[in-house]
Structures are given as C-alpha cells and as structure tokens.
Interface confidence: low
C-alpha cells in the first residue's frame, strides 16, 4: 500500500518552525518511521529537530536545514520510502536589517537607582534608570531590550537573563527588581525579528531594606522554667536583603519586665528563663543590614499560678493572640470584671507605645 500521508515540499524562513508530516502505509506489525535528509539518516536534536507521532518538527530553522527529505516506513516485511520532499529555508526579509544591526554598537553608560515614588500602601520594589549610547550605521534599531539577572556570587554564571522590552531609544526605566541583590544589566537592539549584539554589562548593588513582612508562625510554649519562642522566616520575596537575625520584643508585666533580645544568624527560636506565673506576650521582627522590619502580631502565653490549678483546668499552657486574650482570661476567671478589662486596655496601650518606640528608632 501507498503512504497515507506523503511529506510535502515546504518553504520556510530562517528562525521559523516547520513540520513535515508522514503517514506510513498500513501494515502488521505497525511500521515504524525514520526520517532521511539528502540520502542520509537524519540526526535528531532535542529541542530543535524532533519527531512527534510520525511528523518531523524543526524549530528555529537554519539555512543548512534546506535539502531533500523523505520518511522511511519499516517493519518485518520490509521497507518503503515516501516521496522526496524539497525543503527550502530562505533568509528572512529581516536579513538586511539583521546585517545592519550586527554593525550597531551599544554602550550602556549608566544604571541609576531611582528614588521610590511616594505611594500609599506597601512599599514598591526598586526601579533603575538605564541610559545608553548607540553608534554604527545610520538606521538605528527599532527597539531595545534590557537584560538583567542577579549575581549571587562573583563567579556565578548560572542565573538566566530576564528580558524586558524598553520604552525608550536612549534611556528607560526598569522595574521588577528586588532589594538587597547584586544585578548585572545589559541592553540589546532589535528590529523586527532581527537582534543586534548585546552591550557591555554594568553591575549595580541594590541596597538592603528592612524586611517588608514579619516572621511567620510565631509560637510560644513553656517548659522547665522557661518560655520558648519560635518562628519561621518571613516569605522569601519580602526579605529585601540577607536576614542577619531577629529581634524579639516582650511586653512587660509583673512577671517579666519589658525587654528585647537579639537572635543572630539563622536561628529561629529563643529561650526566655522565667519561673513566675503570668501572661507573656512577644512580637518578633526580622533584621537585615538596614534594620528590623515589621513586627509580627503579638502572641501571648498564660502561665498559671500553681500546678493544682493546671490539673483542674485542661488548658494548661495555651498560646493566644492579644485579641483572644481578653475573652480567654475572662472565661478562666469566671466572667468579666475583676479589673481585667482595665489590665487588658493598659496592656494594649503599652504595646502601642513599645511599637511606636521601636519604629521611631528604625
């Protein structure tokens, strides 16, 4: 039998994709298909020349993909060749522009950190201003693309470049960056599908900022005469630099005077020695080279007065947020009153003062 689908003559442009279809004859066992070019078995290249089903797919066609293609169907009974299909890969209409662009030279002169725009709400990420000079043929490029990547270490070549089409012909603003990172920048000219050579590379270190989110999952537990505070780092995208450590703030009460502790490095817990009963409330902030960031929501722990009471009440050592504390304390002490609301309001005022004092110093 003849082939169900014969490969067709095809014309394509450099850089485009092309597909040659082949449907082998019916046969038992089902014939397998191989592709041949100019009388030789075709070497497949993952990502560029691949076979899907029985079709040959060529992505990013090159001039040397031109030639005569045929597919060969093979099974136990023998081999059959398809018709020969002529494939012609032509230079694109952009070819002249491309040759011109190859002669363009871009000198990236300046990468400047812009002052953040005053906005309400979360602080925006950093933006930079790129400026470059163009030399070469009379016809300038139609557009320019910025390429940037983080440089994790001086020898780090692994980060992929991010590409952003720029809105200017000699300078442009670029966002999408993160505080506390070292970046490499370059600029590339283009016209249509043609691309010119990249500019020189400039480096810029974006300064660290204080973390824009608090540590996550702050918890308190008690044991062996101590209160243990533990937490998780803020989400990575809000670090705004390298987290050097954490500050833990304690609200003062009769049991524990107001205090703060600094935890250095990656450690995410702190032991506070105490033997006195009472409520313990803490907040945690992550610290970068720029200082301490946003404080976590207060978390409180009530240490009861004596073990006999703990035995009567199954809620031995329970963590609370400040908002829950009033309700739970009232339940524990048999309803409202006993000056508890006054104590709670005073605690809230002390918290606000402590936070204001903290932010005043950063």
């Amino acid at each position: 039998e003849d082939f169900q689908i014969q490969p067709r003559d095809t014309v394509a442009v450099v850089g485009e994709s092309l597909v040659l279809e082949c449907g082998p004859p019916w046969g038992y066992p089902k014939p397998s298909v191989s592709w041949w070019k100019d009388g030789k078995p075709l070497v497949l290249q993952p990502g560029r020349r691949t076979v899907s089903g029985d079709s040959l797919m060529v992505s990013r066609a090159e001039k040397n993909d031109s030639g005569t293609y045929m597919c060969m169907a093979t099974n136990n009974a023998g081999q059959r060749e398809s018709r020969a299909a002529r494939v012609s890969i032509q230079e694109s209409q952009d070819h002249k522009e491309h040759l011109e662009l190859l002669a363009v030279r871009i000198q990236l002169e300046n990468v400047t950190l812009l002052n953040p725009e005053p906005v309400k709400g979360p602080k925006p990420g950093p933006s930079v201003w790129l400026s470059w000079k163009v030399s070469g043929p009379a016809a300038p490029a139609e557009s320019y693309t910025a390429l940037f990547r983080t440089q994790r270490s001086p020898r780090d070549q692994g980060s992929p470049w991010t590409e952003v089409l720029l809105r200017g012909l000699q300078s442009a603003k670029l966002g999408g960056l993160h505080w506390g990172q070292d970046y490499e920048f370059k600029v590339r000219p283009s016209s249509g599908r043609a691309r010119g050579p990249d500019s020189n590379v400039l480096l810029l270190r974006l300064p660290e900022q204080v973390p824009s989110a608090p540590p996550q999952g702050v918890t308190l537990r008690s044991g062996n005469g101590s209160v243990f505070v533990s937490w998780a780092p803020p989400p990575a995208e809000s670090h705004n630099g390298v987290i050097r450590g954490y500050q833990v703030w304690s609200l003062g009460n009769a049991s524990l005077p107001a205090a703060n502790w600094t935890v250095v490095g990656e450690q995410t817990q702190l032991e506070i020695a105490t033997r006195l009963p009472g409520s313990y409330c803490v907040q945690v902030a992550a610290v970068t080279g720029a200082g301490a960031g946003e404080l976590s929501t207060p978390v409180c722990l009530l240490l009861e007065q004596a073990m006999e009471q703990s035995a009567r009440d199954p809620r031995k050592h329970v963590p609370w947020t400040l908002e829950q504390l009033r309700v739970d304390l009232e339940v524990l002490f048999q309803g409202p009153g006993s000056g508890l609301n006054d104590i709670f309001e005073a605690q809230k005022i002390e918290w606000h003062e402590a936070r204001a004092h903290h932010h005043h110093h950063h």
Epitope: T150, T162, L165, Q216, G217, P235, A236, E237
Partner: antibody, heavy 119, light 115 residues
C-alpha cells in the same frame, strides 16, 4: 475576554517528545501575566508544570526541570510546551492557564488536551 | 514548598450547607490559597482567594452562596443553600517562592456529591 486553546498530538510514543501549543486571544502574552502549563493525571491530581512570563522569564516544577522546555512566539501570541523522554506516567490532560490578578491563581484556562503516551 | 491536604470526598443535601477544608503544612500555615471547582470533562474554574487571616475575594460570577474563611493552617470553602450544579471536584492551590524559584502546588481535590 482572554481565551486560551491547547493543540497538539493526542498520542505520543514512549521516549519521544511531547509538543503542545497554547494559542491566546484577547490579550497579548508580552503585555503581562504568567503563561502557565498545568496537567491533570487520570486520578484527577493537578500538577503545575511551569510558566513563561510576559517578559520571557521562566520557572519550572523542580521535578520536571531536566526534561521540560516552555517557549513562546509573541508574533503569533502563542506559547509552547515541550516535554522530552515521555513515559506512560506522562499520560494526562494538559491545560494552559493564566492568572487574571494574583499570581498563580488561575482565572483563565484552556479546554485541555488529552495526551496518551503509549507504544 | 507547601503541602495541601484535602479529604477525598464530601456530601450534603440540596439546600443544606457544607464546609470543605484545605490544610497547609505547619511551616506554611500563614499562606494564602485559591479554591477551584471542576465539573466533569471541564477545566478547573477559579472560585476564590482565601487569605491566611480569613479574608477572601471571589472571582467574577461566583454566587454569594460561596464564602471563604481561615483558622490556623486550615482554609475553608463554605457552600450554603447547595444547588445540584455545585456537585464537582474542589481543589485548593497555593503559590510559593523558594530562593527566587516561583511555583505552585495543588491539593488532591475533594469530590463533592449533592444528595
């Protein structure tokens, strides 16, 4: 209204490459968003495979990094999935999707294309 | 990265209410999630965004019968006055950023049956 449509072969042989196209109408893929591939296995489990962003940045599911490639053609407003060395475990319905607002919360989905890996 | 746990199935009667749960592993208990509804032979449909603090934001066209809430590591999707068309698989999904690598994970889905 953004619309996405997947296309590609429904049957792929083991060890070969799976190639799918997502054609986008109603929005330019170079204007914004993350252009994403998600697949759903026969048991209904969903797996995020990777994305290409409007700026050309890519991230892949770590379990697929060695054999996945996502590319785009902005002139045709299409993006593509290529998965090398497929096995029967890659049999699934493949969806392209994109978030309308919050990243990774996918408001817009294609209808899906079923791909069977079998010899 | 986050792990999202959902119960395999749930059911409720017409006109009643149901609360579907998606639980994040403790390390990611503050994360926001998205809920999706999938009818048979259809792509998933985005329903809403539920924040760690319990706030939620519904997608366009989602009826008021659907609401979201949060408690600790649990994220909830509540459907009240259940209708026949609410029978579907409900998935939750969360995004993450691990050392600059962005990504997304999904729960295994809850098959919801209307009795």
């Amino acid at each position: 209204q953004i619309q996405l449509q997947e296309s590609g072969p429904g049957l792929v042989k083991p060890s070969q490459s799976l190639s799918l196209t997502c054609s986008v109408t109603g929005y330019s893929i170079s204007s914004g968003s993350l252009w994403t591939w998600i697949r759903q296995f026969p048991g209904n489990n969903l797996e995020w495979m990777g994305y290409i962003s409007y700026a050309g940045g890519i991230d892949y599911n770590p379990s697929l990094t060695s054999r996945i490639s996502i590319t785009r053609d902005t002139s045709r407003n299409q993006f593509f999935l290529q998965l090398e060395s497929v096995t029967t475990q890659d049999t699934a319905t493949y969806y392209c999707a994109t978030p309308g607002g919050y990243p990774f919360h996918f408001d817009y989905w294609g209808q899906g294309t079923m791909v069977t890996v079998s010899s | 990265q986050p792990v999202l746990t959902q119960s395999p199935s749930a059911s409720a009667s017409l006109g009643a209410s149901v609360k579907l749960t998606c639980t994040l592993n403790s390390q990611f208990s503050t994360y926001n999630i998205g809920w999706y509804q999938q009818h048979r032979d259809k792509p998933p449909k985005y329903v809403m965004f539920v924040k760690g603090d319990g706030g939620h934001s519904k997608a366009d066209g989602i009826p008021d019968r659907f609401s979201g809430s949060s408690s600790g590591a649990d994220r909830y999707l509540t459907i009240s006055n259940i209708q026949a068309e609410d029978e579907a698989i409900y998935f939750c999904g969360a995004d993450y950023n691990n050392a600059g690598q962005y990504g997304c994970v999904f729960g295994s889905g809850t098959h919801f049956t209307v009795l």
